[in-house]
């Protein structure tokens, strides 16, 4: 079923996507906002995906994304065997086959079709802000963060000597 | 090896004030949330106390809510838990522990093996 | 605040039964829950993570199940190790431990 914005909405059977052999520990089914409430959606345009940011009419459902979460020995463990290494990285898909995937030269976030195994541009270091707002790292580029600019989604590079609270990179996760 | 280790229990009288420390090793201290969990004599365990990477945040329960602060120093790899007017009820073994994973407030993968307050006059 | 009921609260079971401890939940909680287990004089030791996936280290007789509101941990086969007590521990909001369940030797 296509919802009003024109992307087939989830279903409660969430979709297959274990990636090069490695299964997603778990996943689940949310709607994303930022960290001042506004949602995020997705429209189809011209045969192609926009991300939009933008208050939702009362009556209007929100958008549901696909989060499966990974487990990833981080790059720099000082200790081989792992205890120090383990981080959380999650990929996002709104709609079946497409994930939002980082465009590091655009400073941008994009939806893609994708085929598997997914691209590391797909996945995203999972950080908890707070008790109930979380922020997206990109794998491919460590300090930068999917984050709000223009009522759009982009990339957003941190200084980590700054605090990393900042409210443009923070998202709340709801069912 | 990962390591967490407490101390600063004993006894204290009911109103009374005391500090708990943990002196973490063998990981990236200020990559990972922190937590204090206590289990009173014979019961079951009750998360206290949690802290962000950065100390930015910090949350209780309404149990000890006002009375009791977390706060860490990253730059000495410590955990601290700050516990003011103490009642007889916060009477149990204090378990500092750690975080799953970088960055996250899932799972408390690594805890230490305690340390014991005791509030009594 | 979410509440967190174990149950049961103790069993008595022997070498090479099949265990099952159920959790539930006041409000739904995803996946977001934890086991672990404990024995007497020492520090809990996280068993299973994220409902159902397997600490490093934890041996296979041992599993969990569940979404929602309502969870289970399994041991396929008792062991002389594995009387302890077990916990449940959900983190989709705030953080609570369900009661504890003792597992003694019939």
């Known amino acids: 079923a296509f919802g009003i914005s024109g992307v087939p909405k989830y279903t409660r059977a969430l979709h297959d996507s274990s990636i090069t052999g490695i299964s997603p520990i778990t996943e689940s089914l949310a709607s994303l906002s930022t960290y001042n409430d506004q949602s995020i959606t997705f429209a189809l345009e011209d045969e192609s995906y926009e991300i939009y940011v933008e208050d939702l009419k009362k009556d209007k459902k929100k958008d549901k994304v696909l989060l499966s979460y990974y487990e990833s020995q981080h790059p720099s463990s000082e200790s081989g065997d792992g205890v120090d290494g383990k981080m959380l990285m999650v990929t996002l898909s709104p709609t079946k086959d497409f994930w939002l995937q980082a465009n590091n030269k655009e400073h941008s976030v994009e939806l893609h079709k994708c085929e598997k195994p997914l691209p590391d541009q797909a996945f995203f270091v999972l950080h908890n802000r707070s008790f109930n707002c979380v922020s997206f790292e990109c794998k491919t580029d460590p300090g930068v963060f999917i984050g709000v600019k223009d009522n759009h989604l982009a990339l957003i590079k941190v200084d980590y000597s700054e605090n990393l609270g900042s409210e443009n990179i923070l998202f709340k996760l709801s069912e | 090896e990962v390591q967490l280790v407490e101390s600063g229990g004993g006894l204290v009288q009911p109103g009374g004030s005391l500090r708990l420390s943990c002196a973490a090793s063998?990981?990236?201290?200020?990559?990972?949330?922190m937590y204090w969990v206590r289990q009173a004599p014979g019961k079951g365990l009750e998360w206290v106390a949690a802290i962000t990477p950065n100390a930015g945040e910090d949350y209780y329960p309404e149990s000890v809510k006002g009375r009791f602060t977390i706060s860490r120093d990253n730059a000495k790899n410590s955990l601290y838990l700050q516990m003011n007017s103490l009642r007889a009820e916060d009477t149990a073994v204090y378990y500092c522990?750690?975080?799953?994973?970088?960055?996250?407030?899932?799972?408390?993968?690594?805890w230490g093996q305690g340390t014991l307050v005791t509030v009594s006059s | 605040d979410i509440q967190m009921t174990q149950s049961p609260s103790s069993l008595s079971a022997s070498v090479g039964d099949r265990v099952t401890i159920t959790c539930k939940a006041s409000?739904?909680?995803?996946?977001?829950l934890d086991w672990y287990q404990q024995k007497p004089g020492k520090a809990p030791k996280l068993l299973i993570y994220f409902t159902n996936n397997l600490q490093t280290g934890v041996p296979s007789r041992f599993s969990g199940s569940g979404s929602g509101t309502d969870f289970t941990l399994t041991i396929s086969s008792l062991q002389p190790e594995d009387f302890a007590t077990y916990y449940c521990f959900q983190y989709n909001q705030g953080w609570t431990f369900g009661g504890g369940t003792k597992v003694e030797i019939k």
């Open positions: 063998g990981f990236t201290f200020s990559s990972y949330w």
């Open positions: 522990a750690r975080g799953h994973y970088y960055y996250t407030s899932y799972s408390l993968g690594y």
């Open positions: 409000q739904n909680i995803n996946k977001h």
